[in-house]
Interface confidence: medium
């Protein structure tokens, strides 16, 4: 199947930032795409492709854009109001409880188990016991057969905040 791409691949390349624009806070908050000045009097725009803010805020700095790693595809670029969207490449996945890196999906199920779920960018293949139908979790002691059509790419660390 086709390769998966990261959010950076989906979004445009980072642009040169225009001069920062200023406006006044509303009830002490600045709109998405801005942060508040140190004296609290101005809202300063985030720099396109460099940082962003998604909500009304009183941040002194905009949040730094994520940069997708080599093992990821960029789905969409970082704008002043939205962070980069990155996704693990085909054959690798990132679990919510270990978001720091894309890990290789298993290529098959252990003996006595059958595959019921595919490798996706957010989950490993899913295996269940042939008889009981219960899910398998943990390390795979032995692989009965290869069940995916492509081995994927090596896992690589995936930074979430720049």
């Amino acid at each position: 199947e086709s390769a998966l791409i990261t959010q950076q691949d989906l979004a445009p390349q980072q642009r040169a930032a225009p001069q920062q624009k200023r406006s006044s806070p509303s009830e002490g908050l600045c709109p998405p795409g801005h942060h508040i000045s140190e004296d609290g009097r101005d809202c300063i725009s985030c720099k396109y492709g460099q940082d962003y803010s998604t909500h009304w805020n009183d941040l002194l700095f905009c949040l730094r854009c994520t940069r997708c790693d080599s093992g990821e595809v960029e789905l969409s670029p970082c704008t002043t109001t939205r962070n980069t969207v990155c996704q693990c490449e085909e054959g690798t996945f990132r679990e919510e409880d270990s978001p720091e890196m894309c890990r290789k999906c298993r290529t098959g199920c252990p003996r006595g188990m059958v595959k019921v779920g595919d490798c996706t960018p957010w989950s490993d293949i899913e295996c269940v016991h042939k008889e009981s139908g219960t899910k398998h979790s943990g390390e795979v002691p032995a692989v009965e057969e290869t069940v995916t059509s492509s081995p994927g790419t090596p896992a690589s660390p995936c930074s979430l905040s720049g």
Partner: antibody, heavy 124, light 107 residues
Amino acid sequence: GVQLVESGGGLVQPGGSLRLSCAASGFTFSSYWMSWVRQAPGKGLEWVANIKQDGSEKYYVDSVKGRFTISRDNAKNSLYLQMNSLRAEDTAVYYCARDLLKVKGSSSGWFDPWGRGTTVTVSS
Amino acid sequence: SELTQDPAVSVALGQTVRITCQGDSLRSYYASWYQQKPGQAPVLVIYGKNNRPSGIPDRFSGSSSGNTASLTITGAQAEDEADYYCNSRDSSGNHVVFGGGTKLTVL
């Protein structure tokens, strides 16, 4: 290999209906957003509609809203386009296209592969 | 939301040509590029920042800046003569839009 094959096109009178089908093979159909794209004779490509992996989200170009319905049957690895109240301007080759990537949220908008297309002619 | 392409571009055999695509949505979403020859279905040649599907020659490359995406063919070949279309998600992120297409002639 990965393949998409459209069917169901033909000649229909204005106001009539057609149902297009797209048979998918060689990949896990239920993992991908799917789209219909059309091309009028001598014209460019126009995205028509797309549908999320589980069918829970569907989007349409404004010109077909309320007349066309996209649907899918993951058990049959099939995509459909029900076209009602057809107009002369709906005359086109209709392509079935798969999203290049498995994505959880919105469609990437990057299409690969494409089917060979099925021709719809709306004429009296 | 619209994407705008030049209707026609020509290039001498072996020379470099750039085909451009403009639209507001390209500030938020990457384009992809398709090659279509007469009587055939479109073929994806570039997607995202600058990614080529397997089987696409490395003379094809992509880039983007501001509201413009570009497809560059370095050392154009006779077989590159075709219509080229860009597309991306529209500004809402849910719909998809195509450019009007560029007819490339290799002289």
